[in-house]
Interface confidence: low
């Protein structure tokens, strides 16, 4: 229904705390360089204004759209052009073009320092002094580094953060209580970020239809007892929620997500028998829980898929009469039978089925033509299954760090023109798939591996779009989202690449590496590994292993030496010489 004042409506629906959190996230995602204090001031002004509209919906400006109100606030910021350059040009436009312009200027890789966690005592002190400000800082710092983070989910992670601090700051050993718990939240939040970015990419590049197809497949896997009409309703609602969040309409997004959670809990009987535990929780936890709820038990009596989609005499007639609905029912029926497949694979199968019907229904004898379609799925299914087996075997043999290094070598050979920091970040993220997925039961591995890899490769594509340097990467990133992962997997050594000349300074290290945390040490070593491959793209695995073992030995020796600086300055050049010889 239409409301006289949109801002009053959202304030009433969401409540002050969530309203303020979401406005802070919105501003931080649009203007990523502003300080917390600058944004907090704007948030307070917007909240005060919303309260006047709640008191009197007819008050001045209360009837304006949220984009107009928020955009006007952002455009009133002093020194906008000095700090944000051409983003300031957005302010010369009218809505809705102004908001579109802001969206286009979101930076997926802002030049901000890494979000460092203060030490436990300091963190607890500032949390106890002012929990609201502390959580505000958290929302601001995460949102500006992840401009497409799913806003209602970020409120959930902030709530988790709050609960952990409340518990651990009361303990004697705060550090050992906080570290593992906060590490866990950070890991989950980072995965959530890349997954949501993938959804927004799908929406931005291929539109709502593509996202809705993704949602139908995902929901059908999770809720195999729900009928097609129910799945379609949920997919439509979920598409709306995600469209709003990806479009910066965070208040509407959070409000509609809460509505969807409410609907699911009130209609459990027609959706799934697994929802009750989620539905007993408060709002943020409930919506989060529903988003990752376990798959319902598959109905025992499902007929073979061939009956309706291959053997039925009316296949071409049904397809011609309502293409999207018929393909939707195919995707629904196939997905509910295959919780063990990735969504990407299910969408590739649906695409193959569509292409087959397009071709065959125009022929003289369609059934003879499309009769083998299910058999033609086989290679499409085998390819990701082999990928999972090969990579999980390798992960089990090498462990996470070794597996990351294997991927780093592989991807540097595929796209040596890509910057080393991007390659290292991608390989580290891709390598985490082992820890995340290879330990799962067999039937959960494939969906976990492929859908996670797809999300990470989406980030590679986004970073590459800013500065395109590799034709290989451009080729894989230009196709459809579901074809990206197979495209990257199929890439081989880039034969067009002219190897980098050997620069001794790239492989020169100093004693400061010894005091770095383990993660930072790994990144330094992986940077050197990528540079080695760029120097010798056709180096064998053996050669690279020899060099990296030598390098690890060198670091170990010099970091244990009494005079570290002397060790690094004398042994370093020897290492460089040995490396050159080993790779000659």
């Amino acid at each position: 229904e239409a409301h006289k004042s949109e801002i009053a409506h959202r304030y009433n629906d969401l409540g002050e705390q969530h309203f303020k959190g979401l406005v802070l996230i919105a501003f931080s995602q649009y203007l990523q360089k502003c300080s917390y204090d600058e944004h907090a001031k704007l948030v307070q002004e917007v909240t005060d204004f919303a309260k006047t509209c709640v008191a009197d919906e007819s008050a001045a400006n209360c009837d304006k759209s949220l984009h107009t109100l928020f955009g006007d606030k952002l455009c009133a910021i002093p020194n906008l052009r000095e700090n944000y350059g051409e983003l300031a040009d957005c302010c010369t436009k009218q809505e809705p073009e102004r908001n579109e312009c802001f969206l286009q200027h979101k930076d997926d890789n802002p030049s901000l320092p890494p979000f460092e966690r203060p030490e436990a005592e300091a963190m607890c002190t500032s949390f106890k002094e002012n929990p609201t400000t502390f959580m505000g800082h958290y929302l601001h710092e995460v949102a500006r580094r992840h401009p497409y983070f799913y806003a209602p989910e970020l409120l959930y992670y902030a709530e988790q953060y709050n609960e952990i601090l409340t518990q651990c700051c009361a303990e004697a050993d705060k550090e050992s209580c906080l570290t593992p718990k906060l590490d866990g939240v950070k890991e989950k939040a980072l995965v959530s970020s890349v997954r949501q970015r993938m959804k927004c990419s799908s929406m931005q590049k291929f539109g709502e239809r593509a996202f809705k197809a993704w949602a139908v497949a995902r929901l059908s896997q999770t809720f195999p007892n729900a009928d097609f009409a129910e799945i379609t309703k949920l997919a439509t609602d979920l598409t709306k929620v995600n469209k709003e969040c990806c479009h910066g309409d965070l208040l509407e997004c959070a409000d509609d997500r809460a509505e969807l959670a409410k609907y699911m809990c009130e209609n459990q009987a027609t959706i799934s028998s697994k929802l009750q535990t989620c539905c007993d929780k408060p709002l943020l936890k409930k919506a989060h829980c529903l988003s990752e709820v376990e798959h319902d038990t598959m109905p025992a009596d499902l007929p073979a898929i061939a009956a309706d989609f291959v053997e039925d005499q009316e296949v071409c007639k049904n397809y011609a009469e309502a293409k999207d609905v018929f393909l939707g029912t195919f995707l629904y029926e196939y997905s509910r039978r295959h919780p063990d497949y990735s969504v990407s694979l299910l969408l590739r199968l649906a695409k193959k089925y569509e292409a087959t019907l397009e071709k065959c229904c125009a022929e003289a004898n369609p059934p003879a033509c499309y009769g083998t379609v299910l058999a033609e799925f086989q290679p499409l299914v085998e390819e990701p299954k082999n990928l999972v087996k090969t990579n999980c075997d390798l992960y089990e043999k090498l462990g996470e760090y070794g597996f990351q290094n294997a991927i780093l070598v592989r991807y540097t050979q595929k796209a040596p023109q890509v910057s080393t920091p991007t390659l290292v970040e991608a390989a580290r993220n891709l390598g985490r798939v082992g820890t995340k997925c290879c330990t799962l039961p067999e039937d959960q591995r494939l969906p976990c591996v492929e859908d996670y890899l797809s999300a990470i490769l989406n980030r590679v594509c986004l970073l590459h779009e800013k500065t395109p340097v590799s034709e290989h990467v451009t080729k894989c990133c230009s196709g459809s989202l579901v074809e990206r992962r197979p495209c990257f997997s199929a890439l081989t050594v880039d034969e067009t690449y002219v190897p980098k000349e050997f620069k001794a300074e790239t492989f020169t290290f100093h004693s400061d590496i010894c005091t770095l945390p383990e993660k930072e040490k790994q990144i330094k070593k992986q940077t050197a590994l990528a540079e080695l491959v760029k120097h010798k793209p056709k180096a064998t695995a053996e050669q690279l292993k020899t060099v990296m073992d030598d390098f690890a030995q060198f670091l170990d020796t010099c970091c244990k030496a009494a005079d570290k600086d002397t060790c690094f300055s004398t042994e370093g050049p020897n290492l460089v010489t040995r490396c050159k010889d080993a790779l000659a």
Partner: nanobody, 115 residues
Framework: QVQLQESGGGLVQPGGSLTLSCAAS????????MSWVRQAPGKGPEWVSA????????RYADSVKGRFTISRDNAKKTLYLQMNSLKPEDTAVYYC????????GSQGTQVTVSS
């Protein structure tokens, strides 16, 4: 279409007994936990009792503990509430719900305890 149909209510004297039934259709009854909820005149809904999908785990509000017994027959797709030692404050419309929901999806059955 999910349907829940309660029956068995009526007028009973304090200390008396009644057994309510709830016939379910339109969903896989045996997969869901169920509850009984009641609403007294002028008051909000109050959760009374719950039972898990298999019937093994039962829960009761403090106000009815020891007097009411919830049970189910999955083959008949029916939920029951055996009410003993009824008190005037048990007067309400009783309805069954899926899970622990207290939102009404049916008409309910009136129980009046009065002398």
């Amino acid at each position: 279409q999910v349907q829940l149909q309660e029956s068995g209510g009526g007028l009973v004297q304090p200390g008396g007994s009644l057994t309510l039934s709830c016939a379910a259709s339109g969903f896989t009854f045996g997969s869901f936990g169920m509850s009984w909820v009641r609403q007294a005149p002028g008051k909000g809904p109050e959760w009374v009792s719950a039972i898990d999908s298999s019937g093994a785990d039962t829960r009761y509000a403090d106000s009815v503990k020891g007097r009411f017994t919830i049970s189910r027959d999955n083959a008949k797709k029916t939920l029951y509430l055996q009410m003993n030692s009824l008190k005037p404050e048990d007067t309400a419309v009783y309805y069954c719900t899926i899970g622990r929901s207290t939102s009404r999806g049916s008409q309910g059955t009136q129980v009046t305890v009065s002398s």
